[in-house]
Interface confidence: low
């Protein structure tokens, strides 16, 4: 008995020969005997099986005395013995069908599980290997499970089914939903427009769902509320935004908020949640915002940056085109009496400069002047 | 089966109609097409499988009509060419049910063909 | 197909019976491939019988089909007023479908 594995809404072609080389009468049936299909004349007629509108054969073949059965839109009941009577002989064909499903749905957040669910025909023991798009290799059983997907596992998956020393394979495609940064750092001179931006790693053609920017000032003892927001269709609607500051936010995707001025008060950690709809867990993105300020007080000249800073950064204030005169990994730097000239506050990780503000010092007999 | 209003085309044109379907999986069903002139019978003019796109034609209406489906939109769509007064007809879309016979049906699109 | 009467006229709560002659067998692996549709004005055929004898569900039980082979009937018994339409035959044995021409069914 020949077998051929077939796989869930897939077509199927079954394969029927006679010794003549013309068309001649001929019929399928299943195991129970119900007729599937065969022709009168050169017309094709259907039984009262389940198959009915699924089935169908090629009429062009039948003159080579070719006669075979297909089947559309495979059922995992479609799994079965077909027999193919033509010449008085039969033609024994076991199908096999095959179905592999992704759990609930192939759009899952960051950090969730996926579980690959494989549907056999009864009587069947086949075995499954499935190759992740950055290369991992999972075997099993019926079900697959991989644990905290990560951006990387989006794309597809290509699974193989083997049985009866066959084998079939499907190609599943999935969507990790995720911010395409799980964390981003901005650096601003105190007074500038602060531009924040949350572009998503995936694409979707209809995007619904609420977020909320929730933030933590360095300065402030318990975190708050910024902004909320209506995701709907792709477009952006807010529904309620505090006083100070006033956040804007764009109309359309990516995510884009705009706080009016960097401040020393508004320096600190975000967490940008966004709740997508008919799924559950939100996702994240972290943001920082550092501001640096450079003063000069009677004869003191000051430099301070606040905000989440990593302890290897240096804060340095030097006079144009001279060394530093003074380089700390510290939060704040300063230089008493201080030569008239162009200051430069730096603020700078292995050599990079992340941040700069000039400030001119006049001599001391005027005020100084802050560009 | 939801199909197209009526038609009023000239003689020569063509004319293409549509039967939406729903309620079911549009590819599981072969889509029939029928038409039924003015007081009289009803005719076969073919069946498209909307899960292939494969269409087989009454002898009488090959070269006449064309028979496709857009599976995205589960909507099957019969054109009807070079028309003639003789097309002037209700053309019905129907699907199979469980048995032999089409057990369920389009409202009909009344095609009129006049100078 | 051909079907018999053209019409008739039957009295509320009587038989009402037509016929439909195949001009060759619409038999096949044992089942017959003949159906049975009413229609009323403006509105499309509604399937009736399928497979020569099996009611079309949702189809009320005054309505039966019988026969095989070339011969097969339709009876509608007892007549009520709501049946007043045209009947239709028509086999699925082979391509192309093929329908009888109509009995025109009147309520006396």
């Known amino acids: 008995k020949k077998v051929v594995l077939g796989k869930k809404g897939d077509t199927v072609e079954l394969t029927c020969t006679a010794s003549q080389k013309k068309s001649i009468q001929f019929h399928w049936k299943n195991s129970n005997q119900i007729k599937i299909l065969g022709n009168q004349g050169s017309f094709l007629t259907k039984g009262p099986s389940k198959l009915n509108d699924r089935a169908d054969s090629r009429r062009s073949l039948w003159d080579q005395g070719n006669f075979p059965l297909i089947i559309k839109n495979l059922k995992i009941e479609d799994s079965d013995t077909y027999i193919c009577e033509v010449e008085d002989q039969k033609e024994e064909v076991q199908l096999l069908v095959f179905g592999l499903t992704a759990n609930s749905d192939t759009h899952l957040l960051q950090g969730q599980s996926l579980t690959l669910t494989l549907e056999s025909p009864p009587g069947s023991s086949p075995s499954v290997q499935c190759r992740s798009p950055r290369g991992k290799n999972i075997q099993g059983g019926k079900t697959l499970s991989v644990s905290q997907l990560e951006l990387q596992d989006s794309g597809t998956w290509t699974c193989t089914v083997l049985q009866n020393q066959k084998k079939v394979e499907f190609k599943i495609d999935i969507v990790v939903l995720a911010f395409q940064k799980a964390s981003s750092i901005v650096y601003k001179k105190e007074g500038e427009q602060v531009e924040f931006s949350f572009p998503l790693a995936f694409t979707v053609e209809k995007l619904t769902g609420s977020g909320e920017l929730w933030w933590q000032a360095e300065r402030a003892s318990s975190s708050k509320s910024w902004i909320t927001f209506d995701l709907k269709n792709k477009e952006v609607s807010v529904k309620r935004v505090t006083q100070d500051p006033k956040l804007q936010m764009g109309k359309k995707l990516p995510l884009h908020l705009t706080l009016p001025q960097a401040l020393p008060q508004y320096a600190g950690s975000g967490n940008l949640t966004l709740a997508l709809e008919a799924k559950t867990g939100k996702l994240h993105q972290e943001v920082n915002l550092v501001v640096m300020r450079a003063t000069q007080l009677q004869k003191n000249l000051t430099c301070e940056v606040w905000g989440p800073t990593s302890p290897k950064l240096m804060l340095s204030l030097k006079l144009e085109n001279k060394e530093a005169k003074v380089s700390k990994r510290e939060k704040a730097v300063w230089v008493l009496n201080p030569e008239a000239g162009m200051w430069q506050c730096l603020l700078s990780d292995s050599g990079q400069v992340l941040l700069e503000s000039n400030i001119k010092v006049l001599p001391t007999w005027s005020t100084p002047v802050q560009p | 089966l939801q199909q197209s209003g009526p038609e009023l085309v000239k003689p020569g044109a063509s004319v293409k109609m549509s039967c939406k379907a729903s309620?079911?999986?549009?590819?599981?069903?072969?889509i029939n097409w029928l038409n039924q002139r003015t007081g009289q019978g009803l005719e076969w003019i073919g069946e498209?499988?909307?899960?292939?796109?494969?269409?087989y034609y009454n002898e009488m209406f090959k070269g006449k009509a064309t028979l496709t489906a857009d599976k995205s939109s589960n909507t099957a769509y019969m054109q009807l060419s070079s028309l003639t007064s003789e097309d002037s007809a209700v053309y019905f879309c129907?699907?199979?049910?469980?048995?032999?016979?089409?057990?369920?049906w389009g409202r009909g699109t009344l095609v009129t063909v006049s100078a | 197909l051909t079907q018999s009467p053209a019409s008739l006229a039957v009295s509320l709560g009587q038989r009402a019976t037509i016929s439909c002659k195949a001009s060759q067998s619409v038999d096949y692996d044992g089942d017959s491939y003949m159906n049975w549709y009413q229609q009323k004005p403006g509105q499309p055929p509604k399937l009736l019988i399928y497979a020569a004898s099996n009611l079309e569900s949702g189809i009320p039980a005054r309505f039966s089909g019988s026969g095989s082979g070339t011969d097969f009937t339709l009876n509608i018994h007892p007549v009520e007023e709501e049946d007043a339409a045209t009947y239709y035959c028509q086999q699925s044995s082979e391509d192309p479908p093929t329908f009888g021409g109509g009995t025109k069914l009147e309520i006396k």
């Open positions: 498209i499988y909307p899960g292939s796109g494969s269409a």
């Open positions: 129907a699907r199979r049910g469980t048995g032999t016979g089409f057990a369920y």
């Open positions: 309620g079911y999986t549009f590819t599981d069903y072969v």
